[in-house]
């Protein structure tokens, strides 16, 4: 039994780091392998992660960690029974993938403006809380070419856009993801998407519609 692709890990900079690797053949990761991880200099016993299968030869392990300090460095030992397959280290602050934002809501109660809000995935005492910026993706369910990204570079988890910039009378979906420049993170996963119907009417169209209506009377 050998490691084909060495473990690579990313941290959410809060409580979980995820390590993935590939073996040289089909493996029952949870019964055959253990990933031991320990903070460098920590005097108490190493923690053990039981991996899960991630495809035939792939394994994934979710390492439970205390709130992360930027200088934290972990030793990683991958064992198959009594055999040490791989030894490495992992510094969470250098491999951050933020948690995905949540609670994405589209507020359509203001006639000419769409307000999108979402929740910051970190508590206020986490370093990333004040360092996230976001990308909002809006697309049309009817027209694959109607696909746009809005970069939100300020801290407030919200975006205002003119309803008139979207096509009227059709359904749109939106999703949001986050990253933090300070730790040169990767992008988070996208949030779950939310759907709404863009019923905005141009003022001229509204006027024209009303005029036509009266004409019928």
């Amino acid at each position: 039994m050998k490691v084909l692709q060495e473990p690579t890990c990313v941290s959410d900079y809060m409580s979980i780091s995820t390590c993935e690797w590939k073996m040289n053949g089909p493996t029952n990761c949870s019964t055959e392998l253990r990933l031991l991880y320990q903070l460098v200099f920590l005097l108490s016993e190493a923690h053990t992660c039981i991996p899960e299968n991630n495809g035939g030869a792939g394994c994934v392990c979710h390492l439970l960690m205390d709130d992360v300090v930027s200088a934290d460095n972990y030793t990683l030992d991958l064992w198959a029974g009594q055999q040490l397959l791989w030894k490495g280290s992992f510094k969470p602050s250098e491999h951050v993938k933020p948690r995905a934002p949540g609670n994405l809501t589209v507020h359509t109660n203001v006639s000419d403006t769409l307000l999108l809000t979402w929740s910051n995935p970190y508590p206020p005492d986490n370093y990333l809380y004040n360092h996230l910026t976001y990308a909002v993706n809006i697309w049309s369910e009817n027209d694959p070419a109607d696909f746009r990204i809005y970069n939100v570079t300020y801290l407030e988890p919200s975006l205002r856009i003119a309803a008139s910039t979207l096509k009227s009378g059709i359904s749109y979906r939106a999703r949001v993801r986050a990253w933090a420049q300070c730790y040169n993170t990767t992008w988070s996963e996208w949030s779950p998407s939310t759907k709404w119907h863009n019923s905005y009417r141009e003022p001229f169209e509204q006027h024209h519609h009303h005029h036509h209506h009266h004409h019928h009377h």
Partner: antibody, heavy 119, light 108 residues
Framework: EVQLVESGGGLVQPGGSLKLSCAAS????????MSWVRQTPDKRLELVAT????????NYPDSVKGRFTISRDNAKNTLYLQMSSLKSEDTAMYYC????????????WGQGTSVTVSS | DIQMTQSPASLSASVGETVTITCRAS??????LAWYQQKQGKSPQFLVY???TLAEGVPSRFSGSGSGTQFSLKINSLQPEDFGSYYC??????????FGGGTKLEIK
């Protein structure tokens, strides 16, 4: 309930030796790092010895290096501190403390045993 | 070794008041800092780790903050059981971890 109970303290002459013990209960002793911390009469705290969970790694400050030895017997759930070539400045209350599972802070302390070095 | 300097060495306060104790490290220790409380005649008790995370069972009137070299422990609405001595301790790097000199908090 986590309990750490120190014993072995007492009055000893300068240059003498003493061995302190700490009986641990209420947790899986063999998985925790342990330490000895002393509190001098002026109430200052000093970490005098640390040992990792399996006993393979120990550490001491310069003030006691070569004179103090920390050891553990995981089968007996007991931590030890062998002190030799004692000096008057070693007079203190000696506490046994357990290292937190996820950080090197000390989450449980014993009630302490008093060591007095005097002629 | 990294030196830890606590201030003030002592302070008097009344029940209900808010107090802040500070701890300064001689070099960057990131957030590798713990706080302990010691009542007269008792052993120290674990209060805070990682500079800001409360240990299990510690009341929310306690809060830790800071990183790098400057740290503080704040106690809101002091209770009678809060009086005693407080110590900071760093645990950065190899195990030559040092304590601050302590702060004695007395009832006014």
């Amino acid at each position: 309930e986590v309990q750490l109970v120190e014993s072995g303290g007492g009055l000893v002459q300068p240059g003498g030796s003493l061995k302190l013990s700490c009986a641990a209960s209420g947790f899986t002793f063999s998985t925790y790092g342990m330490s000895w911390v002393r509190q001098t009469p002026d109430k200052r705290l000093e970490l005098v010895a640390t040992i990792n969970s399996n006993g393979g790694s120990t550490n001491y400050p310069d003030s006691v290096k070569g004179r103090f030895t920390i050891s553990r017997d995981n089968a007996k759930n007991t931590l030890y501190l062998q002190m030799s070539s004692l000096k008057s400045e070693d007079t203190a209350m000696y506490y046994c403390a357990r290292f937190f599972r996820i950080r090197n802070a000390m989450d449980y302390w014993g009630q302490g045993t008093s060591v007095t070095v005097s002629s | 070794d990294i030196q830890m300097t606590q201030s003030p060495a002592s302070l008097s306060a009344s029940v209900g008041e808010t107090v802040t104790i500070t701890c300064r490290a001689s070099e960057n220790i990131y957030s590798y800092l713990a706080w302990y409380q010691q009542k007269q005649g008792k052993s120290p008790q674990f209060l805070v780790y990682n500079a800001k995370t409360l240990a299990e069972g510690v009341p929310s009137r306690f809060s830790g903050s800071g990183s790098g070299t400057q740290f503080s422990l704040k106690i809101n609405s002091l209770q009678p059981e809060d009086f005693g001595s407080y110590y900071c301790q760093h645990y950065y790097g190899t195990p030559t971890w040092t304590f601050g000199g302590g702060t004695k908090l007395e009832i006014k």
